[in-house]
């Protein structure tokens, strides 16, 4: 089918466009181009007869058109009026007509835009600024750039007037930036020169430097003032309210005690009309003062608060030193010194951080020490401990229980028996107890400063007779040659004898067996697999003798060096190879095989049917015990001979 392609489709004024013809039929008589979407003699641009190769201009010919033998039409020096449709009329040799229409659009080349502003010196937090992109151009798109980035999303930025106007509401000093606008149409894009927004601001509260406020007599005082401001601020200095000079720096050489006082810096912005002042109190000492420590928190709470200790006074050109517990500062991530060493910060204080702390000021001759400061760290209460630890008492004795919980300030204590409040004391005393005094004894510790409470509950049984004992262990699965195990015979009772048996026999003499805690605890050091036996404890008092159920120690061990069976290493071709690996281990190990270093299967038995000399090589069995984290292996060389070549060889399994 006959089609027209416009190259380009969007054409800039003054440029050219080619109306390219596709699928032009053969055996043509001629063709004609028309302006518009139909064949209209009044709007013919040019005609062409193939036989004569003659081009004939039509009424719409402008002299800028060139027709090519392939029927394509070139239009040069494009003007706005050229926009629109163009129709090609083709007359074939059989005088049958064919038509096709194409089109293009003409756009002007855009000029370089510029930015106009409604306020050249807006005041921070007060004024708005509207930037407008000039000129206003039809069919153009407007874009804005801030510091060569696209516009940030902000409620203070608003685009209007078809994006031609950018308004900044309530300008801030951070709006001081390079602003550009860009105009775009299908044939061109132009960017303006940048406009720098000059936001007037300040002055902010001035800062006086250096920060130190303590000086020695004879030193020079050199104070500098700075306040953020646009335009830059004008500065004035006042000493004790009296004007001194209109400079940014104040210099007084060889100061004396009389130069002590309040020093005021005033910053003034002539454009915004604003003034701000800052006052610093300068103290001039006749000679170095004795230092002292100030703290930002006199009662810090453990694990919650940080404490900043500052060595006063602040003196220029001075070395500050610190001591904790009469030692130089330990290295600790919780201890931080400021750059000038004047402030020591304890992050997340603990009860061990009480001190004492001392700071020192080093001068030419000596170090002046502050008085020591002790931190009052509030902590606790920790879980209270009830002593003694006995849970069984015989009738008729006095029950005297003491409760203690680490706490600052010291805890307040309460006792409850079976949930009923008894007394608000640290010690509970009951004389001549009977079985009716059996029950749950609760000690409650309360810290009035933190408001925290902690309780411990102890079951007390009053009985002449002891119960059947039981064994508790601190390690249910010890690892051979590594762990120790402590067995404890429960309960703990007064006037009680504790005894131990292993496999029904009294304890063997061994440096690895140790009795402690009144024979109530039996410790096995460096356990071995041979310690996996039945342990029984017995308790005896005035009226009872009783044994616990046995506890069997489950010692984890191995894997030992594995053994591969059968031991044969020579096989005849065609035999079956059936290797079994075994390693002493608890729990049972995991097995895996490698042949010539290549992993095989994860089984205890390796089976290969009808082996050949190709099966020669090294057969390695690997064992691993996940519980002990240990591994072991063994390697065996296997030789396979061709049948009948080597008498006396094993036939295999």
């Amino acid at each position: 089918k006959l089609t027209i392609e416009s190259t380009p489709f969007n054409v800039a004024e003054g440029k050219e466009v080619l109306l390219l013809v596709h699928n032009l039929p053969q055996h043509l008589f001629g063709y004609s181009w028309y302006k518009g979407e139909r064949v209209d003699g009044n709007r013919q641009i040019i005609g062409y007869v193939i036989g004569t190769q003659q081009a004939t201009p039509g009424p719409a010919y402008s002299g800028r058109e060139i027709i090519y033998p392939n029927a394509s039409l070139l239009i040069q020096n494009i003007i706005q009026n050229d926009t629109g449709f163009y129709t090609l009329h083709v007359i074939k040799s059989d005088l049958v007509n064919e038509e096709a229409t194409g089109q293009f659009r003409v756009y002007p080349e855009l000029p370089k835009p510029s930015i106009s502003s409604n306020n050249s010196k807006p005041v921070e937090d007060k004024d708005a600024v509207a930037f407008t992109c000039e000129p206003e151009t039809q069919d153009a798109t407007y874009l804005w750039w801030v510091n060569n980035q696209s516009l940030p999303v902000s409620p203070r930025l608003q685009l209007s007037n078809g994006n031609r106007t950018l308004t900044l509401f309530n300008v801030t000093r951070n709006d001081t930036a390079s602003y550009k606008c860009e105009t775009q149409n299908p044939v061109s894009a132009r960017r303006s020169d940048s406009v720098i927004l000059n936001v007037l601001y300040g002055p902010d509260a001035p800062t006086i430097s250096p920060l130190n406020t303590s000086y020695r007599s004879g030193e020079n005082l050199n104070l500098s003032c700075h306040a953020a401001s646009n335009p830059p601020a004008q500065y004035s200095w006042f000493v004790n309210g009296t004007f001194q000079q209109s400079t940014q720096e104040l210099f007084i050489p060889n100061i004396t005690v009389n130069n002590s006082g309040s020093y005021t810096c005033q910053a003034h912005n002539s454009d915004t009309g604003l003034n701000r002042t800052t006052v610093t109190t300068i103290t001039v000492y006749a000679e170095p003062p004795k230092p002292f420590i100030t703290s930002n928190n006199s009662n810090p709470v453990e694990d919650e608060d940080a404490v900043a200790l500052t060595c006063e006074p602040e003196i220029q050109n001075t070395t500050y030193l610190w001591w904790v517990n009469n030692q130089s500062l330990p290295v600790s991530p919780r201890l931080q010194l400021s750059n000038d060493n004047r402030t020591l910060t304890l992050l997340s204080v603990t009860r061990n951080d009480v001190g004492p702390y001392e700071c020192g000021i080093q001068n030419e001759l000596s170090v002046d020490h502050s008085d020591p400061v002790i931190l009052n760290v509030l902590y606790g209460p920790d879980d209270p401990t009830i002593s003694p630890s006995y849970t069984y008492y015989r009738p008729g004795v006095n029950l005297s229980l003491s409760c203690h919980a680490a706490s600052n300030p010291p805890a307040q204590y309460s006792w409850l028996i079976d949930g009923n409040i008894q007394q608000h004391t640290q010690e509970l005393f009951i004389s001549n107890i009977t079985e009716k005094n059996s029950g749950l004894y609760t000690c409650q510790a309360n810290n009035s400063a933190s408001g925290h409470s902690r309780t411990t509950v102890k079951t007390i049984t009053v009985s002449a007779e002891l119960p059947k004992p039981s064994i508790s262990s601190n390690n249910s699965k010890p690892v051979e040659d590594k762990d120790a195990v402590a067995f404890t015979c429960e309960p703990e009772a007064q006037n009680t004898t504790y005894l131990w048996w292993v496999n029904g026999q009294s304890l063997p003499v061994s440096p690895r067996l140790q009795l402690s805690n009144g024979n109530r605890t039996l410790t096995l050091f460096n356990v071995t697999r041979n310690d996996a036996r039945a342990y029984v404890c017995g308790i005896q008092n005035s009226v009872s003798a009783n044994r616990s159920d046995p506890v069997t120690l489950d010692v984890l061990y191995g894997p030992d060096t594995p053994i591969i069976s059968p031991p044969d290493s020579s096989y005849l071709s065609g035999a079956n190879l059936n290797l079994s690996c075994h390693s002493a281990s608890n729990p049972s190990p995991q097995y895996s095989w490698r042949i010539n270093g290549i992993p095989q299967q994860h089984t205890q038995v390796l089976f290969i049917a009808k082996i050949t000399p190709n099966n020669n090589g090294t057969y390695a069995c690997f064992v691993s015990n996940l519980a002990t984290g240990r591994n072991n292996s063994i390697v065996k060389s296997i030789t396979v001979s061709a049948s009948g070549t080597s008498p006396g060889l094993s036939a295999g399994a």
């Epitope: 009738p395 009985s463 005896q540 005035s542 009226v543």
Partner: antibody, heavy 120, light 106 residues
Framework: EVQLQQSGPGLVRPSQTLSLTCTAS????????MHWVRQPPGRCLEWIGW????????EYAPKFRGRVTMLADTSKNQFSLRLSSVTAADTAVYYC?????????????WGQGTLVTVSS | DIQMTQSPSSLSASVGDRVTITCSAS?????MHWYQQKPGKAPKLWIY???NLASGVPSRFSGSGSGTDYTFTISSLQPEDIATYYC?????????FGCGTKLEIK
């Protein structure tokens, strides 16, 4: 072999003091609590008390407190019972008794018993 | 004091019979212990801590119970079992005994 051998008079005058001794063999009394029990003729068993020979601690039944004293002599591996101001009601067979671990087993050992008659 | 009430006070049974003796304590006790005494002999510990047989005691003997009520059982009475049996509590002082159950053969 563990044994408790009792000795002491079989006849005591009213208002006098009954005194019995129990000598132990086969174990060390210092490691155990030693009891005394009595059985009046045709009546129930009555526990009198115990002594801890290691430190001399004692525990007496309230019925006998004030009249009874138990003592131990660990060097001789023996202990004794003294009951003062006896009456006919104190006529009984008196036993010494110990509960100990003999090897792996908890064992109960008794003396042969001494019949004490209170009579004038 | 904890009173121990043993019943029956005497019992006549045939060889092979199942025999049950009960002991009731006036207050709850941790365990009950049972003694066998033959005429002219010292008592022997027979069952300790409610249900454990003392060394050498035949398995036809058993004990059970908790709190205040305990039972002593002979599953099949034998001639050598003829004796007086006493219960004892050791939970609180003074230690107290029941007054015994005298066992006879019919």
């Amino acid at each position: 072999e563990v044994q408790l051998q009792q000795s002491g008079p079989g006849l005591v005058r009213p208002s006098q003091t009954l005194s019995l001794t129990c000598t132990a063999s086969g174990f060390n009394i210092k490691d155990n609590y030693m009891h005394w029990v009595r059985q009046p003729p045709g009546r129930c068993l009555e526990w009198i008390g115990w002594i801890d020979p290691e430190n001399g601690d004692t525990e007496y039944a309230p019925k006998f407190r004030g009249r009874v004293t138990m003592l131990a002599d660990t060097s001789k591996n023996q202990f004794s019972l003294r009951l003062s101001s006896v009456t006919a009601a104190d006529t009984a067979v008196y036993y010494c008794h110990v509960l100990i671990y003999a090897g792996y087993l908890a064992m109960d050992y008794w003396g042969q018993g001494t019949l004490v008659t209170v009579s004038s | 004091d904890i009173q121990m009430t043993q019943s029956p006070s005497s019992l006549s049974a045939s060889v092979g019979d199942r025999v049950t003796i009960t002991c009731s304590a006036s207050s709850s006790v941790t365990y009950m212990h049972w003694y066998q005494q033959k005429p002219g002999k010292a008592p022997k510990l027979w069952i300790y801590s409610t249900s454990n047989l003392a060394s050498g005691v035949p398995s036809r003997f058993s004990g059970s119970g908790s709190g205040t009520d305990y039972t002593f059982t002979i599953s099949s009475l034998q001639p050598e079992d003829i004796a007086t049996y006493y219960c004892q509590q050791r939970s609180t002082y003074p230690l107290t005994f029941g007054c015994g159950t005298k066992l006879e053969i019919k």
